[in-house]
């Protein structure tokens, strides 16, 4: 979109050294050529750019360039060239669900979020027909129904940037030694010694007109013998400019010959550098006393003077001026580049400008939602727009519960379970899934008949100590798990059918853990004396540390797909912070021994995040954005513990790389499991054995013993050849063969080779604390003694 | 300014079904967290929940008349409806229809009808 | 279902400060409303969640509690408070009202 603020100065002969020429001779700074943004208003900024190849997420200009394929047929032209709201490009368009139709002639579609925001994004204005007006009363209404500060109507400027805050305006009479330029036009008045100067100093060059000067007007003339006044310097090149601003620094004239000749700044910190290069004290600056030979230290000081009258100070925007000097500043939505050019601010630098999507024009930005999110006009935050409302579902040990966040409406969705800490939910198909820290089993059952024990299906009830932390993959049909006594993390099919220890090696005390199916990794906290959290592919590969400084207890992390960030509580040090997926922008939410006082689960929805809090036995909600708005949501809860949103828009649907291959299972003849997408080049998935077999050459077929032909792993961390006999026969593998129980021998997998080791006994110290008192540790003991052995939970 | 409005049969005999109306303005049940709420107060009692439909038509039936109860919408005429089937002596009652609010007011409900007094009776 | 119990009447002199009772037999966590009912009038909501304010309510009006036991207090009480006052949880299924208290003047 052009710059609306730009404008209103005269073609230029010759730009300044960061300026680029346009064609119709205006300068405009150099940093905005080739920006996709017409600045010209002749596009010749935008011409002979190096052509893009854009993105397929992009939509490609008939030009080249390349701008966002949802900015296509919006209503806005963001090519140069106009070509993504051609009538080609958008005719029989059907606007989505989340825009708004421009109306039956118009074949456009804005976001919805435009409608009634004070801008005409539609050509006709249909997106602001029908509006009530917005402005308070101390407020003018503008054209384009944005608001403006009434002090801003007829000062001169187009503050609306429609120009209707300066229309109809009575014309201010210029004083008496004053020039109207623009003759009776209303034009800007200037102080009468500036007429006939050889310097435009009218937008329309009246004063220097032929007509009035009586001589042909500025041009290639030469130098003036003298300028109009002795507090100015004469360029080389012909303009006078402010004596003040020789050897200043700054190059003012065309040619730089204000700096050009000047002795070296000799002068001391309280002393005033004259225009010939002599000192004198910096008191003696403007007292209205001739101080400099050449008269500098009072040039501009004259009462009165005006900089901003004469080239608008060489300011790009808004020249203020001051008591001694002026002053360049810019509109709402740009910054000063270099004391004298504005650029455009981008605010979506900012990741929380926006709850979702941030664009970035000149001069201001404007927010969009994702696709089944809907902005709240109030509130200005994607609200999810469709379908069920979202439904808070956690555990307090002994049952799993369910708020609904909009309706508040309360219920228990299993009741009678032994010792709960961990679950997860499948949307798609209505599935709970839960751990048991007393029976040591993974359960799962549909949501509406999960309260009835004999719908609650047994995953997983071997080799089993500690689970703590469960998530479901929703695409790849996975469930993960962390389990804090056999320090290890495992992965199994979500009917518990196969099952894969990934990790065993380097886990003091895994805790929390959350996939991101959509881009292949994993994440789980570990509160043990190093804390951290970590991140792997669902494989298993590409294992690293994201945040190990600190960091105490990280008890539940939370992923927000859509913003690609990891939230976190930590216990000891009652705080809940975020970072990005790569571990960097970290930021800390809220530090609160109040609010976080021993928070265990977090999750996030919208633009709020949700965690409980064992010692306030409560829920708490927050904005996920800055931290502010904290509010309880239910107290009075008794442990409240893993905590999860039901939602169809938290696990958004994804193509199964493993079902879309030729071969079923993606040819792999036990697990298939998605690989991460860290470039285009990554694998879609790898295949895994059981713990108890070894992958073959193929790196799809599962051997009860290594194959003689050595073989090597696909782990990116660590790299073993091993030696190999042959399948033994009759010894084909089926489904029926692979046992639940694992005795932990390596295997070489696509996942983790050498990450699986027998699992050490269990150093866990019980508790002596009871989980209903106040002083929450992080070890409990189990409840159940038939079990004999002591439990690392909640 | 929110308005809800009852309409009913007035009198019916025992077995009839009975259909309210409920005529709502300045709010609309197509707004997320919007609900609409029927109650009712047999004279010199205290009140009782009936049904409510939310605007993702989500509907609850109180378990204590379930299978006699019907709640509807009609969005584009800003209206709600309830039945209630097998009419009985003690239906006899003023029934309210309000607007619920969703989210931190918590299911409150906001804005009430005038109610309309319904009466079975052979 | 969850049993709201309040007292049926209470009789108090203008400008003192009453306090009207609410006790729930289960937990209803901070889920309580109150309400004001006159013959002949639309009820009115004037506590949402236990302590807030419904818009428009006077702020003599205030709730508190917790858990089970929930107390809606006038200070100072004005001649036209005179009503029932119903106390309302929505946290179990189904929403149930309590039994209204009558607030008389003396």
């Known amino acids: 979109a052009a710059d609306p603020l730009l404008g209103g100065q005269g073609p230029a002969k010759d730009c300044e050294k960061d300026q680029f020429q346009c064609r119709n001779e205006r300068c405009i700074p150099s940093v905005w050529r080739c920006d996709e943004d017409d600045d010209c208003l002749d596009h010749s900024d935008e011409d002979d750019c190096p052509k893009k190849t854009c993105a397929d997420s992009d939509f490609t200009c008939d030009n080249g360039h390349c701008i966002h394929e949802r900015w296509k047929c919006d209503g806005e032209e963001e090519c140069p060239d106009g070509s993504d709201e051609s009538e080609a490009t958008c005719t029989k368009q059907v606007c989505p669900a989340e825009k708004l139709s421009c109306g039956p002639t118009s074949h456009k579609c804005v976001p919805a979020s435009w409608r009634c925001d004070g801008e005409k994004d539609c050509e006709g204005g249909a997106d602001e027909a029908g509006c009530a007006t917005l402005c308070a009363p101390h407020e003018f209404q503008c054209g384009n129904r944005s608001c403006l500060a009434a002090v801003f109507v007829c000062d001169g400027d187009d503050d609306c940037g429609d120009g209707s805050d300066e229309r109809g305006c009575a014309d201010p009479a210029c004083g008496p030694r004053e020039f109207r330029c623009g003759g009776d036009g209303g034009g800007a008045c200037i102080p009468e010694r500036w007429v006939c100067d050889r310097q435009f100093d009218c937008e329309d060059r009246s004063d220097e007109a032929a007509e009035l000067c009586g001589r042909p007007g500025p041009g290639a003339t030469s130098a003036p013998a003298a300028c109009a006044t002795a507090s100015q310097f004469a360029c080389r090149s012909g303009e006078c400019v402010h004596l003040g601003w020789r050897c200043d620094g700054d190059r003012d004239c065309k040619d730089k010959s204000d700096e050009a000749d000047c002795p070296l700044g000799t002068c001391r910190g309280d002393e005033f550098q004259c225009g010939d290069g002599t000192c004198v004290l910096a008191i003696k600056h403007c007292n209205q006393e001739q101080d400099c030979p050449d008269g500098s230290d009072e040039a501009g000081c004259l009462q009165g003077l005006n900089e901003c009258l004469h080239n608008n100070g060489g300011c790009s925007h808004i020249c203020t001026d001051l008591k001694i000097g002026f002053e360049c500043t810019c509109p709402a939505g740009f910054q000063l580049l270099d004391q004298k050019t504005c650029g455009d601010i981008d605010e979506c630098k900012d990741p929380d400008a926006c709850s979702q999507i941030c664009v970035n024009y000149k001069g201001y930005f404007k927010c969009e939602c994702y696709p089944g999110y809907e902005m709240d006009l109030l509130t200005k935050n994607c609200k999810a727009a469709a379908g069920k409302s979202p439904s808070l579902i956690f555990t307090n040990r002994h049952e799993v519960r369910r708020i609904d966040l909009v309706k508040r409406n309360y219920s228990r969705l299993i009741p009678m379970l032994k010792n709960v800490v961990a679950l997860d939910v499948e949307v798609a198909t209505n599935r709970i899934y839960w751990c048991d820290l007393s029976y040591r089993k993974i359960y799962s059952a549909y949501m509406d008949k999960a309260s009835d024990p004999k719908e609650q299906e047994v995953l997983i009830d071997e080799q089993l100590h500690s689970p703590e932390g469960l998530a479901v993959d929703w695409v790849h049909k996975h469930i993960y798990w962390t389990d804090s006594g056999n320090k290890t993390i495992s992965v199994a099919t979500v009917d518990g059918g196969r099952r894969r220890t990934l990790f065993s090696r380097n886990l003091s005390e895994p805790r929390a853990i959350a996939v991101d199916p959509l881009r292949g990794f994993m994440y789980w906290s570990d509160w043990g004396d190093q804390a951290k959290i970590e991140k792997s592919g669902l494989n298993g590969v590409d294992r690293q540390t994201l945040v190990s400084d600190n960091i105490e207890w990280p008890n539940g992390i939370t992923l927000d797909l859509l913003s690609q960030r990891l939230y976190w509580v930590d216990s000891k040090l009652h705080q809940l912070s975020s970072i990005d997926f790569s571990g960097g922008n970290r930021k800390t939410l809220i530090s609160s021994t109040d609010f976080l006082s021993h928070p265990f689960g977090i999750a996030v929805f919208e633009d709020k995040v949700f965690w409980t809090d064992l010692e306030n036995e409560a829920i708490f909600s927050a904005n996920r954005l800055n931290g502010l708005e904290i509010s309880i949501l239910a107290e009075n809860l008794n442990n409240p513990h893993d905590i999860v949103i039901f939602h169809e828009l938290k696990q958004p649907r994804a193509p199964d790389a493993c079902e879309l291959s030729v071969q079923p299972n993606g040819g792999c003849e036990y697990l298939c499991l998605p690989a991460p997408q860290i470039s285009s080049h990554s694998p879609k998935y790898t295949c895994a054995c059981p713990d108890t077999m070894w992958l073959g050459p193929d790196m799809k077929r599962c051997y009860r013993a290594p194959q003689s032909t050595s073989t090597t792993t696909l782990a990116s961390t660590m790299t073993r050849t091993v030696p190999a006999t042959t399948r033994a026969p009759g010894t084909t593998v089926h489904r029926s063969t692979y046992q639940n129980h694992s005795t932990e021998t390596p295997s070489l997998t696509a996942a983790v080779p050498s990450s699986v080791s027998v699992p050490r006994a269990p150093s866990i110290s019980p508790s002596t604390l009871s989980p209903a008192t106040s002083n929450h540790s992080q070890h409990y003991a189990n409840e159940d003694s038939k079990m004999g052995s002591t439990v690392t939970a909640a | 300014q929110v308005t809800l409005k009852e309409s009913g049969p007035g009198i019916l005999q025992p077995s009839q079904t009975l259909s309210l109306t409920c005529t709502f303005s300045g709010f609309s049940l197509n707004t997320y967290g919007m609900g609409v709420g029927w109650v009712r107060q047999p004279s010199g009692k205290g009140l009782e929940w009936l049904a409510n439909?939310?605007?993702?038509?989500?509907?609850f039936y109180n378990p204590s008349l379930k299978n006699r109860l019907t709640v509807s919408k009609d969005t584009s005429n800003n209206q709600a409806f309830l039945r209630i089937t097998n009419g009985d002596t003690a239906d006899t009652a003023t029934y309210f229809c309000a607007r619920i609010l969703g989210e931190d007011i918590g299911g409150a409900l906001d804005a009430w009808g005038q109610g309309t007094s319904v009466t079975v009776s052979s | 279902d969850t049993v709201l119990t309040q007292s049926p009447a209470l009789a108090v002199s203008p400008g003192e400060r009453v306090s009207i009772s609410c006790r729930a037999s289960?937990?209803?966590?901070?889920?309580m409303h109150w309400y004001q009912q006159n013959p002949g009038q639309q009820s009115k909501l004037l506590i949402y969640r236990t302590s807030n304010l419904a818009s428009g309510v006077p702020a003599r009006f205030g709730g508190s509690g917790s858990g089970t036991d929930f107390t809606l207090t006038i200070d100072p009480v004005e001649a036209d408070d005179t009503a029932t006052y119903f106390c309302q949880q929505s946290w179990n299924d189904p929403p149930t009202f309590g039994g209204g208290t009558k607030l008389e003047l003396k």
């Open positions: 289960e937990g209803v966590n901070s889920y």
């Open positions: 439909i939310w605007w993702d038509d989500d509907k």
